[in-house]
Interface confidence: low
Amino acid sequence: DSSKWVFEHPETLYAWEGACVWIPCTYRALDGDLESFILFHNPEYNKNTSKFDGTRLYESTKDGKVPSEQKRVQFLGDKNKNCTLSIHPVHLNDSGQLGLRMESKTEKWMERIHLNVSERPFPPHIQLPPEIQESQEVTLTCLLNFSCYGYPIQLQWLLEGVPMRQAAVTSTSLTIKSVFTRSELKFSPQWSHHGKIVTCQLQDADGKFLSNDTVQLNVKHTPKLEIKVTPSDAIVREGDSVTMTCEVSSSNPEYTTVSWLKDGTSLKKQNTFTLNLREVTKDQSGKYCCQVSNDVGPGRSEEVFLQVQYAPEPSTVQILHSPAVEGSQVEFLCMSLANPLPTNYTWYHNGKEMQGRTEEKVHIPKILPWHAGTYSCVAENILGTGQRGPGAELDVQYPPKKVTTVIQNPMPIREGDTVTLSCNYNSSNPSVTRYEWKPHGAWEEPSLGVLKIQNVGWDNTTIACAACNSWCSWASPVALNVQYAPRDVRVRKIKPLSEIHSGNSVSLQCDFSSSHPKEVQFFWEKNGRLLGKESQLNFDSISPEDAGSYSCWVNNSIGQTASKAWTLEVLYAPRRLRVSMSPGDQVMEGKSATLTCESDANPPVSHYTWFDWNNQSLPYHSQKLRLEPVKVQHSGAYWCQGTNSVGKGRSPLSTLTVYYSPETIGRR
């Protein structure tokens, strides 16, 4: 309606004696600014005077006169929008209607606001969600329709009279729409909060109690259970009886069903609050609980661990690890089901008790072949001693032991023999699968671990074999000790160091590189003639006649070996020179005569010189002196001289007679 002034403010405001009231208010006048404002208490319109009667709490006029009441009541508004008021303190008799008489230059308006002042502070109001379930977070709200700037208040939450630990969020509203103070508390109730009293307490600034509101919590929760067991420690022996009782300590709403569980699995036909177990067996050991359900869900009791004690069961042995390599470490573990756990163990190796081994584990830091075998154990607890189980086999693997190379032949072995060797060993695990031989040769292995050397060489000194499984073990080399005839027999000249000259002292050595056996004999031979039986052949003064082809022989018990023929060369000056004449020593003049200087020399004569009867050297230097045609005056005695690197030799005189031809004689 355009003829109305427009006001906005809370319809009713609440307060209590001694507090204050703050009235948020806005308005819009029909025209112009506000010129006069009067605040009435319970105004009544007087038709006679056409004015409002009532207590004037506040008055603002053009002349500015203000009644003394104005100190308590304040108009905090302005001339065109704000009409906010404050009454501080507020009294019980301020309850009723407040009338805001507004006048502008041309218009008047009376706006009514309800004020409700109580004698004592009124209680806040707690608001709860429609349903509360355990462990689900809810928000509790405490609302008070009061707020005033001049009168600070606080709202505190209590649970069973004790301040709640959770932090509350307090908010206030002083608006034209609403005036209130609100506290919100986020809270996760547990089943134990069911039926508990929650209080929202109104306090002044000093924490003094003003009023409160209380509610009883209705926390929906699954049944809460307590389990009782006889005997109380839940430790029994096989054949004993056990009773378990399930007690419901709380359920909201009421429970509907009961069941029992063992190790999480429901027990059939057990739907009462008592579980009776008669003559228990060890299989009945486990975790027991009861389960009771209501509309919220199932609730479970704490678990009772029922221990049915029994003597150890037959034990088994676990080996870490088998097969084991010699030198490695091995751990044996004795496994036996028992309750209580075994306190003592007895260990057996190949049926014999291992002294001093009483632990669940046996550790052998360094396994040796003699550790192999069957390991078993016996476990013992307070109820008795278990039986020895089947045991476990420890297989200790190791390289072949004590490997030897054995010569099968009768001794001695001779060069060229066929030799058979075998590779023997003391023990091996795993079994020997192959053999190796050193040195390698083109030899045959007729069977595993046997080596056959056909036509054994003189130089086959040592042979070693290895027996191999996963590893190879080598035997010490064995000496074949092959016997053979002397080898590499040769003649060696010891002296002189240079060439042999006639008359020199000469020594020849008969050498050989090796012989087995070592004991040898020597033989020297020239042209099939035995010369000596020593390793050396000596000439005190060599003569050209000693030259020739020499051999030496060395023999041992196996055989004899000859050297290559060695030529002994003796160097000497020309000797046995003579002049031979052809066709004879008497030649007819005019014919041809040839004189030859014959000699024995080593090296051969390299240079000849011819002499006549006057010892005159002739200008001829070859072996033959040819006279052609021969003249009578050539008659006479001739001799020659031969020269080689060793020296010279001369012939005796040889006479040539040249006679006249018949013609010459005829001419005479």
Epitope: Q329, Q355, G356, R357, P365, K366
Partner: antibody
């Protein structure tokens, strides 16, 4: 030839630590267990513990668990024993010894190291 | 731990005399090992696995025993046998030694 060469004698103050060494030669280091033993002057032998270089495993005599720490350096074939928080009670000869392959028993011994703890 | 008790602690013997020393274990053991130690020297393995002589040990030495009771015997004492002899067990950890028997020449 199997040899165990131990470090030289040492004079140490109470509360301090000392690290003894035992260098092995003449055999494959990782093949045998090396033990440490203690012998106080004029007294018997006490086993401290063993170190197995093949696997790095160690076993201590409970009595020496907080006293001795065994380690090894495979590259130099050396086993070490560190003795900590020394007191005069720890003054003794310390030997390293080796299990012989093929039988238990300490077949090879180091020459021993004399440790003297004195302020 | 298994305590080994050696007796006597000290003994003396004439050259050529037979010598026997004993070693008792508080708990039964599989085998006993014997060591010889001379002054200012490292111990030497003397007898292994109760009765086996270590390499280089003279044949006049012998070892025997089982369970808790073991002994070392010298058939004919010689001057070089004067030393301290220790027994030791390898059956259970910790490996323990006896306190030794000191053998002197009379």
């Amino acid at each position: 030839k199997v040899q165990l060469q131990q470090s030289g004698a040492g004079l140490v103050k109470p509360g301090a630590s000392v690290k003894l060494s035992c260098k092995a030669s003449g055999y494959t280091f990782t093949d045998s267990i090396l033990h440490w033993l203690m012998q106080r002057s004029g007294q018997g032998l006490e086993w401290i513990g063993w170190f197995y270089p093949g696997s790095g495993s160690i076993k201590y005599n409970e009595k020496f668990k907080d006293k001795a720490t065994l380690t090894a350096d495979k590259s130099s074939s050396t086993v070490y024993m560190e003795l900590s928080r020394l007191t005069s009670e720890d003054s003794a000869f310390y030997f390293c010894a080796r299990h012989e392959d093929g039988y238990d028993g300490f077949a090879y011994w180091g020459q021993g190291t004399l440790v003297t703890v004195s302020a | 731990e298994n305590v080994l008790t050696q007796s006597p602690a000290i003994m003396s013997a004439s050259l050529g005399e037979k010598v026997t020393m004993s070693c008792r274990a508080s708990s039964s053991v599989n085998y006993i090992f014997w060591y010889q130690q001379k002054s200012d020297a490292s111990p030497k393995l003397w007898i292994y696995y109760t009765s086996n002589l270590a390499p280089g040990v003279p044949a006049r030495f012998s070892g025997s025993g089982s369970g808790n009771s073991y002994s070392l015997t010298i058939s004919s004492m010689e001057g070089e046998d004067a030393a301290t002899y220790y027994c030791q067990q390898f059956t259970s950890s910790p490996f323990t030694f006896g306190s030794g028997t000191k053998l002197e020449i009379k």
